[in-house]
């Protein structure tokens, strides 16, 4: 009988130890969750406040509506220009409307005057189609004014208030474009 009682007591003690362990694990887990929650909240607050404080466009970029534009200060061939823009999370300028064209040409007049600037327009040498790099065709009013006589690959550029075409391997300034950050949170 005494042996039975001591066995039961030992089993109860074992159960108690297991429950204490479980409670300890639960407390640890709860603490860990609370810490994670604090971290997440802090992260969210930091993200929100930095988004709140940051301007819609990076330094040295110009904003118009929901776009940011960067006018390069170096010359490069068309392909290198696009690679430079892509590195900045942008692409060579894709002109969607006459309003956008007017804004760009107006801004260029103020900044630099009458130079050549590559945009994201290239001509397929076989079909003769002009294409923006997303694959869309320019609207009829935004087709390059002169067809280049070059046997090489032909790309589009802006000069003054015109869209023109040239051998893609010639050196020009370029204009990058990306979406502006939404400033309202």
């Amino acid at each position: 009988k005494l042996l039975q009682v001591s066995t039961i007591a030992m089993q109860q003690q074992e159960k108690l130890i297991q429950q204490e362990r479980a409670l300890l694990n639960f407390t640890e887990w709860k603490r860990s969750c609370a810490l994670q929650m604090k971290y997440c909240q802090a992260f969210m607050q930091n993200s929100l406040s930095s988004a709140h404080n940051s301007s819609p466009c990076p330094n040295n970029w110009i904003q118009n509506r929901e776009s940011c534009y960067y006018v390069s200060e170096i010359w490069s061939i068309w392909h290198t220009s696009q690679e430079n823009c892509l590195k900045e999370g942008s692409t060579l300028l894709q002109i969607e409307s006459k309003e956008e064209m007017d804004f760009i040409t107006g801004s260029l007049r103020k900044i630099k005057g009458s130079y050549d600037y590559w945009v994201g327009l290239s001509q397929d040498g076989h079909s003769g189609r002009w294409l923006w790099q997303d694959g869309s065709s320019p609207s009829p009013g935004l087709l390059p004014a002169e067809r280049s006589q070059s046997a090489n690959q032909v790309c589009g550029y802006v000069k003054s208030n015109s869209l023109l075409s040239s051998n893609c391997s010639t050196w020009k300034y370029f204009i990058c474009e990306k979406y502006a950050l939404r400033s309202s949170v």
Epitope: W78, H79, Q82, E83, C85, L86, T91, S122, D124, G125, L131, W132, Q133, D134, G135, S136, N152, Q153, C168
Partner: nanobody, 112 residues
Framework: QVQLVESGGGLVQPGGSLRLSCAAS????????MTWVRQAPGKGLEWVAH????????TYTDSVEGRFTISRDNAKNTLYLQMNNLKAEDTAVYYC?????RGQGTQVTVSS
């Protein structure tokens, strides 16, 4: 250095299918329009299809419209051309093209 490597060509019977691939390197693939062109025996280069940088605006030459599908996987830097219901007149060397640069091509022969 820009490199384009086409594969997937072969001999197929009329009405059959093939899927061509083009592995691209040396440039930011996801930032550019990509094109498939072909050269039939004794003929010049012919534009087949192109696709926009993000996979939209796929456009085809009339003779392959509805039979061929151009697609791309920017994560894999790979361009594809799915060719169904192939005809004898589709026999050609197929090239993928980026800014006038082409690979070595892959031969597609449609014959019974």
């Amino acid at each position: 250095q820009v490199q384009l490597v086409e594969s997937g060509g072969g001999l197929v019977q009329p009405g059959g299918s093939l899927r061509l691939s083009c592995a691209a390197s040396g440039f930011t693939f996801s930032g550019y329009v990509m094109t498939w062109v072909r050269q039939a025996p004794g003929k010049g280069l012919e534009w087949v299809a192109h696709i926009g940088s993000g996979g939209g605006h796929a456009t085809y030459t009339d003779s392959v419209e509805g039979r061929f599908t151009i697609s791309r996987d920017n994560a894999k830097n790979t361009l594809y051309l799915q060719m169904n219901n192939l005809k004898a007149e589709d026999t050609a060397v197929y090239y993928c093209e980026f800014l006038g640069r082409r690979g070595q091509g892959t031969q597609v022969t449609v014959s019974s």
